[in-house]
């Protein structure tokens, strides 16, 4: 009976340790509002354990509920800059496959120079997340000011 | 064969339940920008399970990737106060050992009176996290307005 | 001896996968500052796995430490609107049972149109969380702008 109980345990690999924290690589060409991300120990404190990068966008490898979080700071910014260039908006969404395209998280800068938020959302293997920064202001590439990550939470 | 499968399970203690949520104790003397934290059930809803406090700074006890989060609200503040006293900046970083010193998370208040953010970052046993509030404005000690915490996420 | 080791493993059901992500349903009548939430796959990307809704408020079903997060965006808002209607404040707290009533998380909008934050807090089975929006401005019901969730983290 104790032996049967052990079978209800959770195998290590099914714990879904999938997690990623990315730093900004670059912005896209004009007409492309996407931010392009990079990650890996050679770059500092960013990493990918499970998810992968596909041309700078984050692709999910395991179905489940994820905590998605982001912080974006504008590079040359004061409250007057931010309000004069309003609206500057950051949206995180599933951008492919097209059939699952949806905005998950959206924030405007108004008179601030940083946005930060997080949410729980179901994601499926193959979902690619895009982060769109609309407006004319550029994001800071400092790794403590601009970052984007996901953490698998449960099946 | 079923018995061998049980051996791939994850022992409870290796799940790394390390977690802490702290409330503001006090600010440092002038020329010391650090916030000093405290935690424990006698103080309300703050706690330390694994990490420890070392002279008001949070010390990590288990290697791993952590979710670090913080919210700081300024005590006497309006949007005009915040902009007049700009820059008021909050930075969370590893402050010791000196060889691992780095800024992990940085936000400015601009015309706002609260900053809140979170990020995933690798931390090692012995890392001490410091939270530096630069500028002349003082943080609120209300436990629902100012808090700082970490949560172990994976090895 | 290997068999005894297996008994220290963590059963799947005790991992406490309790998690919920809610979208705004409606605001209360005048004199009732509470936001009323809804969740479920039929509504989009919101869900309840463990916690339940009780008249639009979130009720906890499992003791433990939870990560509570929220984002609220005001519906018709600019930085001038927000400052003219100041103070507009969002508070998340335990509202029942009355003996455990406490504010967990509080933010003011000042000149911004979105607040977002998160914190770790102990919650007990039967705790009901309320989110109070005080002021005259109304929240957006867009699911990527206003959401509220909890995630069980540890016992």
């Amino acid at each position: 009976q104790r032996f049967a109980q052990a079978q209800q345990q959770l195998p290590l690999e099914s714990l879904g340790w999938d997690v990623a924290e990315l730093q900004l690589n670059h912005t896209g060409p004009q007409q492309d509002p996407r931010l392009y991300w990079q990650g890996g120990p050679a770059l500092g404190r960013s990493f990918l354990h499970g998810p992968e990068l596909d041309k700078g966008q984050l692709r999910i490898h395991r179905d489940g509920i994820y905590m998605v979080h982001i912080q974006v700071t504008l590079a040359i910014c004061s409250s007057t800059t931010a309000s004069r260039h309003h609206p500057t908006t950051l949206a995180v969404g599933i951008c492919s496959p097209a059939s699952r395209s949806i905005s998950l998280l959206r924030l405007s800068f108004h008179q601030g120079c940083t946005i930060a938020s997080q949410r729980l959302t179901p994601l499926a293997r193959g979902d690619t997340l895009c982060t769109n920064l609309t407006g004319t202001l550029l994001p800071s590439r400092n790794t403590d000011e601009t970052f984007f990550g996901v953490q698998w939470v449960r099946p | 064969q079923r018995f061998a499968q049980a051996q791939q399970q994850l022992p409870l203690e290796s799940l790394g339940w390390d977690v802490a949520e702290l409330q503001l104790n006090h600010t440092g003397p002038q020329q010391d920008p650090r916030l000093y934290w405290q935690g424990g059930p006698a103080l309300g809803r703050s706690f330390l399970h694994g990490p420890e406090l070392d002279k008001g700074q949070l010390r990590i006890h288990r290697d791993g990737i952590y979710m670090v989060h913080i919210q700081v609200t300024l005590a006497i503040c309006s949007s005009t106060t915040a902009s007049r006293h700009h820059p008021t900046t909050l930075a969370v970083g590893i402050c010791s050992p000196a060889s691992r010193s780095i800024s992990l998370l940085r936000l400015s208040f601009h015309q706002g009176c609260t900053i809140a953010s979170q990020r995933l970052t690798p931390l090692a046993r012995g890392d001490t996290l410091c939270t530096n509030l630069t500028g002349t404005l003082l943080p609120s000690r209300n436990t629902d307005e100012t808090f700082f915490g970490v949560q172990w996420v994976r090895p | 001896q290997r068999f005894a080791q297996a008994q220290q493993q963590l059963p799947l059901e005790s991992l406490g996968w309790d998690v919920a992500e809610l979208q705004l349903n409606h605001t209360g009548p005048q004199q009732d500052p509470r936001l009323y939430w809804q969740g479920g796959p039929a509504l989009g990307r919101s869900f309840l796995h463990g916690p339940e809704l009780d008249k639009g408020q979130l009720r906890i079903h499992r003791d433990g430490i939870y990560m509570v997060h929220i984002q609220v965006t005001l519906a018709i808002c600019s930085s001038t609107t927000a400052s003219r209607h100041h103070p507009t404040t969002l508070a998340v707290g335990i509202c029942s049972p009355a003996s455990r009533s406490i504010s967990l998380l509080r933010l003011s909008f000042h000149q911004g149109c979105t607040i977002a934050s998160q914190r770790l807090t102990p919650l007990a089975r039967g705790d009901t969380l309320c989110t109070n929006l005080t002021g005259t401005l109304l929240p957006s019901r867009n699911t990527d702008e206003t959401f509220f969730g909890v995630q069980w983290v540890r016992p």
């Epitope: - | 409330q23 104790n25 006090h26 600010t27 003397p29 002038q30 103080l43 309300g44 002349t136 | -």
Partner: nanobody, 116 residues
């Protein structure tokens, strides 16, 4: 048990000055912050000035440059020097001391009336 008692309030003309004092009796220890609040009729209590154990001070926009908060070294007294008083400064003024352990000690309040 700690008790706080304010004094120094009264009636003063616009442009005048007052010095409020707040004396602490009882076993006072581990104080990390002292504050002055005020409450005008029909308004919420407003935080006016703060001083920390480290000596840092902050003031509300409405009083900055006119009011000065200070304390004695043992937290036995807290002071608020109010200069260039205006009719809108009329309120009941309360002193507050906060301990490390989040105990909040309050005085009963002293009335300040500024006539034009």
């Amino acid at each position: 048990q700690v008790q706080l008692q304010e004094s120094g309030g009264g009636l003063v003309q616009t442009g005048g000055s007052l010095r409020l004092s707040c004396t602490a009796s009882g076993s006072i220890f581990d104080i990390v912050r002292g504050s002055w609040y005020r409450q005008a009729p029909g308004n919420q209590r407003e935080l006016v000035a703060i001083i920390t154990s480290g000596g840092a001070t902050n003031y509300a926009d409405s009083v900055a440059g006119r009011f000065t908060i200070s304390r004695d070294s043992a937290w036995k007294a807290l002071y608020l020097q109010m200069n260039s008083l205006k009719p809108e400064d009329t309120a009941v003024y309360f002193c507050n001391m906060e301990s490390v352990r989040y105990r909040n000690y309050w005085g009963q309040g002293t009335q300040v009336t500024v006539s034009s």
